[in-house]
Interface confidence: low
C-alpha cells in the first residue's frame, strides 16, 4: 500500500474542524503580475508582500506595485502602498531585510530616466512606517547590511562606485571608485576589488583587492593580480593570476588579508573555475573545475587553515561557472552532505558523506521501494536525489532537498531508486536519521515544508491543475491526513512558512482565474489546534546520531565525538513550541586514523586509512610557504580533521619549524602591501 495508508496509521482526531477554524483566506486586489514575500524579523509574525505588474506600452513599460503587511503570520494583510507613496518598487532588488531582529527594511524604487540618483524607502520598525530617501547615485546592487551593525549599509552604483551609509541609508558617501565587487567581512570590514585601466571585465585577473576597516577612512591593498575573491567561514579566498601564464591559483588568508598562503590546490585555466561549496569556521569544501567543458570537477576539503587540501570526491557534477551543482548541506545532522557525480557513462548518481567529506557512499535503497529501469540488478540499487541540477533541467522536481537544524535527522527530497538519477516522475523520500536510511514518503512530486521543529510536515501535490488539498503528517512522514482548505481550487504557486521551521503556520499562495480577472490569493493555516498540548519529557526519546552498529563501542563517532539527542517520538502528537531547543549530549571518542587527514606531501590510497608519502616528494624536505615565511614540516603524514574533537588513542607526531626565510608564493609580500588614508 502507499505510504500513509496502512491500517496502523492513527488518525488525528477532528482535524477538519480544527483546521477549518484556523484557515484564513486573503484575496489581493491585484492583477496577477509577480509576487514576492519576505519575513521581517524572527518570531515577529511580520510578513511583507510586494506585488508588481508590468504593463507593456508602445514606447516603454509602465509598472505598478503594491505593498502589503501582515503581523499575524499571514492570516490578515493590510495594504500599506501609501506608506511608500504608491511608488513602483524594483523587484530585481527585492526587499532588503535587516539582519537578526533589527526590524529594518529597504525597498529600492524605480525612478525616471533623467534623475540624478535612485530612491529608497527605509523602515526601522518592522515596516510600520517608511522614510523616503533620494540617493546621490543609481544603485547597481541591493543594499547590503553589515552583519555586525544594521545601520551600516553598502551598495555599488551603476558607475562602479562603492557607497557606504553609516546611518541606515539616510546619508551616503562614495568611498571608492572603479569597484567591481564588494562584501562585508567581520567587524564591519569591507573587502572589495578595483580596476585600474578599463573595466571590471577588461581587468579581470589584474584587479586589486582592498580592505577598509573603518568604513572608508583608510584603505589597505591586500592583493594584486586578482581574478575574484570570496569569504567563507573565517577564511578569505582570492584567486590570483600566475606570473607566467593565464592560470590562476587560490590563496587563503585567516587574518583578513594581512598575510596569505597559497592553497595546495590545482591551478585552473581561463575556462575553469573554483567554487566554495560550503565553509564554516573549521574548514571549507572547494570545488575545482576540470579542464575542458566536462561539467564536472573535484571536491577538496581543507585543513583548519584552509591551506592543505585532501581530495574528497572525483567527477563532482558542477556545470559552468555560476551553473548548477547538487551540493547540499544536510543541516539536520552534523557532518552530512549530499551531492551528485557524473559517471563515465554520463549518468548522474547521488553520493552522501556522513563525515564532512572524508568518505562518500551511495544512498541506501529505501526498504519500501523497487529498483527502476536504470538498475542493472533489480535487487541492488541506490536512492538518487534530485536537486538544483534536475530543477535546472526542467525535470518534474518542484523543490530541492529540505532539512532544518532544529528538526534533527529529518531530510526530505525528491528521488528515484536505481543505478542513476531517472528522468521519470520522481517520488518524495524521507530520512529520519540524517540520510543513513530512507523511506518513500509520498507518491509523485510535491512541495513540502517542516513546521514546529519537525512535529508537522506539510505537503502539496505538484500539479498543473488547480488544487485545494493539503496533506500533513505528525509522525515524520509515516502517515498522512488530507485537508481541503478551500472549495474553489487555486493555481498553486508556492508554500511559505517562517524560516527556521519553528512556526505552526503555513501559507499557501496561488491565484484564481475567472472569465475576466486573475487575482493573488493566500490561505494561511495554523496547526496549533492539531498539536493540542505542549510536549512533555515522556514525548521524547533518546537517539544516538550516526549510529550504524550498536554493538560497536565507537558507534556514532563522527569527527571525534558522538551526540545523543532527545527526539520527539513519532507517536506523540504535541507541540515542540517556538522556544524548542534541540537537546543534545556530546561525548568525546578516542582518536583513530579516521580522525586525521593526510598532511602536506601525503595522500591516502583508496580503501586505506593510512597516509603515505607522495612519490614525487619522497626523500625531499617538506618545505612550503605559509604566511609569507618558508616553513619546514616534520610530519608522519597526518593532521587532525578540522572540527574533530577526538582525544587519546592514535596520536601522530607533527611539527612545523619556521625556516626564517621569506617567500612570496606568487603573491603579495608585506613590503608590496600599501596603506592609504582618505
Amino acid at each position: 500500500s502507499a505510504p500513509g495508508e496502512d491500517e496502523e496509521c492513527g488518525r488525528v482526531r477532528d482535524f477538519v474542524a480544527k483546521l477549518a477554524n484556523n484557515t484564513h483566506q486573503h484575496v489581493f486586489d491585484d492583477l496577477r503580475g509577480s509576487v514576492s514575500l519576505s519575513w521581517v524579523g524572527d518570531s515577529t509574525g511580520v510578513i511583507l508582500v510586494l506585488t508588481t505588474f508590468h504593463v507593456p506600452l508602445v514606447i516603454m513599460t509602465f509598472g505598478q506595485s503594491k505593498l502589503y503587511r501582515s503581523e499575524d503570520y499571514g492570516k490578515n494583510f493590510k495594504d500599506i502602498t501609501d506608506l511608500i507613496n504608491n511608488t513602483f518598487i524594483r523587484t530585481e532588488f527585492g526587499m532588503a531585510i535587516g539582519p537578526e531582529n533589527s526590524g529594518k527594511v529597504v525597498l529600492t524604487a524605480e525612478v525616471s530616466g533623467g534623475s540624478r540618483g535612485g530612491r529608497i524607502f527605509r523602515s526601522s520598525d518592522f515596516a510600520k512606517n517608511f522614510v523616503q530617501t533620494d540617493l546621490p547615485f543609481h544603485p547597481l546592487t541591493q543594499m547590503m547590511y553589515s552583519p555586525q551593525n544594521s545601520d551600516y549599509l553598502l551598495a555599488l552604483s551603476t558607475e562602479n562606485g562603492l557607497w557606504v551609509s553609516k546611518n541606515f541609508g539616510g546619508k551616503w558617501e562614495e568611498i571608492h571608485k572603479a569597484v567591481c565587487l564588494a562584501k562585508w567581512g567581520s567587524d564591519n570590514t569591507i573587502f572589495f576589488t578595483t580596476y585600474a585601466n578599463g573595466s571590471c571585465k577588461a581587468d579581470l585577473g589584474a584587479l586589486e583587492l582592498w580592505r577598509t576597516s573603518d568604513l572608508g577612512k583608510s584603505f589597505k591593498t591586500i592583493g594584486v593580480k586578482i581574478y575574484s575573491f570570496g569569504l567563507g567561514g573565517r577564511f578569505l579566498f582570492a584567486s590570483v593570476m600566475a606570473d607566467k601564464d593565464t592560470t590562476r591559483r587560490i590563496h587563503v588568508s585567516t587574518d583578513q588579508g594581512d598575510t596569505w598562503s597559497m592553497a595546495q590546490l590545482p591551478s585552473v585555466g581561463q575556462e575553469q573555475f573554483y567554487s566554495i561549496l560550503a565553509a564554516n569556521d573549521d574548514m571549507v569544501f572547494m570545488h575545482v573545475d576540470e579542464p575542458g567543458d566536462t561539467g564536472f570537477g573535484t571536491i577538496f576539503t581543507s585543513d583548519d587553515r584552509g591551506i592543505v587540501y585532501s581530495k574528497s570526491l572525483d567527477r563532482h557534477l558542477y556545470t559552468t561557472t555560476g551553473g548548477e551543482t547538487d551540493f547540499t548541506n544536510v543541516t539536520s545532522l552534523r557532518g552530512v552532505y549530499i551531492t551528485s557525480v557524473l559517471s563515465e557513462d554520463n549518468s548522474i548518481q547521488t553520493m552522501i558523506t556522513f563525515d564532512q567529506g572524508g568518505r562518500w557512499t551511495h544512498l541506501r535503497k529505501p526498504e519500501n521501494s523497487e529498483c527502476d529501469a536504470t538498475a542493472k540488478n533489480k535487487n541492488e540499487c541506490s536512492l538518487h536525489i534530485h536537486a538544483s541540477y534536475s530543477i535546472s533541467q526542467k525535470l518534474n522536481v518542484p523543490m530541492a532537498p529540505l532539512s532544518e537544524p532544529n528538526a534533527v535527522g529529518i531530510v526530505i527530497a525528491h528521488g528515484s531508486v536505481g543505478d542513476a538519477i531517472s528522468v521519470m516522475v520522481p517520488d518524495v523520500y524521507i530520512s529520519d536519521d540524517g540520510g543513513y536510511s530512507w523511506t518513500k514518503m509520498l507518491e509523485g512530486p510535491h512541495y513540502y515544508t517542516i513546521l514546529d521543529s519537525g512535529g508537522i510536515i506539510v505537503a502539496i501535490e505538484h500539479s498543473s491543475r488547480p488544487i485545494n488539498v493539503i496533506k500533513f503528517s505528525t509522525d515524520e512522514g509515516q502517515c498522512w491526513q488530507t485537508y481541503t482548505f478551500t472549495r474553489d481550487p487555486i493555481y498553486f504557486t508556492g508554500l511559505a512558512s517562517e524560516p527556521g521551521a519553528r512556526s505552526m503556520n503555513i501559507s499557501i499562495w496561488g491565484f484564481t482565474e475567472s472569465f475576466l480577472t486573475s487575482q493573488w490569493v493566500s490561505y494561511t493555516i495554523d496547526f496549533k489546534d492539531i498539536l493540542e498540548r505542549n510536549c512533555e519529557e515522556k514525548d521524547y526519546t533518546i537517539w544516538l546520531a550516526h549510529s550504524t552498529d550498536p554493538e560497536d563501542y565507537e558507534d556514532g563517532c563522527i569527527l571525534g565525538y558522538k551526540e545523543q539527542f532527545l527526539r520527539l517520538r513519532k507517536s506523540s502528537v504535541c507541540q515542540n513550541g517556538r522556544d524548542y531547543v534541540v537537546t543534545k549530549q556530546p561525548s568525546i571518542c578516542l582518536c583513530s586514523l579516521e580522525d586525521f587527514l593526510c598532511d602536506f606531501g601525503y595522500y591516502r590510497p583508496e580503501n586505506d586509512s593510512k597516509c603515505v608519502e607522495q612519490p614525487e616528494l619522497k626523500g625531499h624536505d617538506l618545505e612550503f610557504c605559509l604566511y609569507g615565511r618558508e616553513e619546514h614540516l616534520t610530519t608522519n603524514g597526518y593532521r587532525k580533521i578540522p572540527g574533530d574533537k577526538c582525544q587519546g588513542g592514535v596520536n601522530p607526531v607533527r611539527e612545523v619549524k619556521d625556516l626564517k626565510k621569506k617567500c612570496t608564493s606568487n603573491f603579495l609580500s608585506p613590503e608590496k602591501q600599501n596603506s592609504k588614508s582618505n
Epitope: L544, Y553, G556, S587, N651
Partner: antibody, heavy 124, light 107 residues
Framework: QVQLVQSGAEVKKPGASVKVSCKAS????????MHWVRQAPGQGLEWMGI????????SYAQKFQGRVTMTRDTSISTAYMELSRLRSDDTAVYYC?????????????????WGQGTTVTVSS | DIQMTQSPSSLSASVGDRVTITCRAS??????LNWYQQKPGKAPKLLIY???SLQSGVPSRFSGSGSGTDFTLTISSLQPEDFATYYC?????????FGGGTKVEIK
C-alpha cells in the same frame, strides 16, 4: 552472567616476558573495549592501555609504550596482554576490565566488569 | 597526563555516617569521571560513571556530583560493607588516570 576470567599467577625473572589472558563470557565480546590496569602491592591503580572491540585499535600509556602488546582472539573471546623486559617494579596484580557502554552510548570509558586479577611476581 | 588528586587519603567513620570524598583534576575533564570501590584482595567495582550516573546494582546511598575539575563521591549513610578504598578515574584524555585512593576505615 557477564564475567572475565584471567589466567593464573606467574613468577618471572627480570628481562623475561609475561602474557596474561582474559576470557570473556556472557556478552558479545566484539562489542566492547578491553582495558588493562595494574596494581602494585599496597599501591593504587595504574592504567596500561586499551584494545578495541575488533583488536584493530590499541592505545597504550606512554610508560608502557614499546614493552606492552595487547591483542585479542575474537574466535575464543579472549584478550591478551603481554609485557616484555620485565623489571622488579613490574610486580603487581594485572586486571583486564571491560569498557562500559550503555544503550549504544559512550559513557566516558568507565570499566564495568573486571577480571579477578593475575598476580605477576618479578624476582631474580 | 592529567593528575587526579583525591582527598582525604584516608578517613575513619562510623556506620550511619555521611561520608564525602573529593577528587580534583589538574585540568577540566568535563563530566568524564568515574568512581570505583575496591576491597582488599578483590578487583575494583564501578560505582558511578560520567560523574553522577549510578551504575546498575549499586545502592542508591552512593552518589556523585561535579564537573570540570572538582568532583565528589558521597555515601549518605555508611554501611558495614562500605569500608573499602575508593578511587576516582578520569576518561577524558588518554592516558586514563586514577586518583591515589581514599581508604575508608572503621572508627
Amino acid at each position: 552472567q557477564v564475567q572475565l576470567v584471567q589466567s593464573g599467577a606467574e613468577v618471572k625473572k627480570p628481562g623475561a616476558s609475561v602474557k596474561v589472558s582474559c576470557k570473556a563470557s556472557g556478552y558479545t565480546f566484539t562489542s566492547y573495549m578491553m582495558h588493562w590496569v595494574r596494581q602494585a602491592p599496597g599501591q593504587g591503580l595504574e592504567w596500561m592501555g586499551i584494545i578495541g572491540p575488533s583488536g584493530g585499535y590499541t592505545s597504550y600509556a606512554q610508560k608502557f609504550q614499546g614493552r606492552v602488546t595487547m591483542t585479542r582472539d575474537t574466535s575464543i573471546s579472549t584478550a591478551y596482554m603481554e609485557l616484555s623486559r620485565l623489571r622488579s617494579d613490574d610486580t603487581a596484580v594485572y586486571y583486564c576490565a571491560r569498557g562500559k557502554r550503555s544503550s549504544g552510548w559512550y559513557e566516558g570509558y568507565g570499566m564495568d566488569v573486571w577480571g579477578q586479577g593475575t598476580t605477576v611476581t618479578v624476582s631474580s | 597526563d592529567i593528575q587526579m588528586t583525591q582527598s582525604p587519603s584516608s578517613l575513619s567513620a562510623s556506620v550511619g555516617d555521611r561520608v564525602t570524598i573529593t577528587c580534583r583534576a589538574s585540568q577540566s575533564i568535563s563530566s568524564y569521571l568515574n568512581w570505583y570501590q575496591q576491597k582488599p584482595g578483590k578487583a575494583p567495582k564501578l560505582l558511578i560513571y560520567a560523574a553522577s550516573s549510578l551504575q546498575s546494582g549499586v545502592p542508591s546511598r552512593f552518589s556523585g556530583s561535579g564537573s570540570g575539575t572538582d568532583f565528589t563521591l558521597t555515601i549518605s549513610s555508611l554501611q558495614p560493607e562500605d569500608f573499602a578504598t575508593y578511587y576516582c578515574q578520569q576518561s577524558d584524555v588518554s592516558p586514563i588516570t586514577f586518583g591515589g585512593g581514599t581508604k575508608v576505615e572503621i572508627k
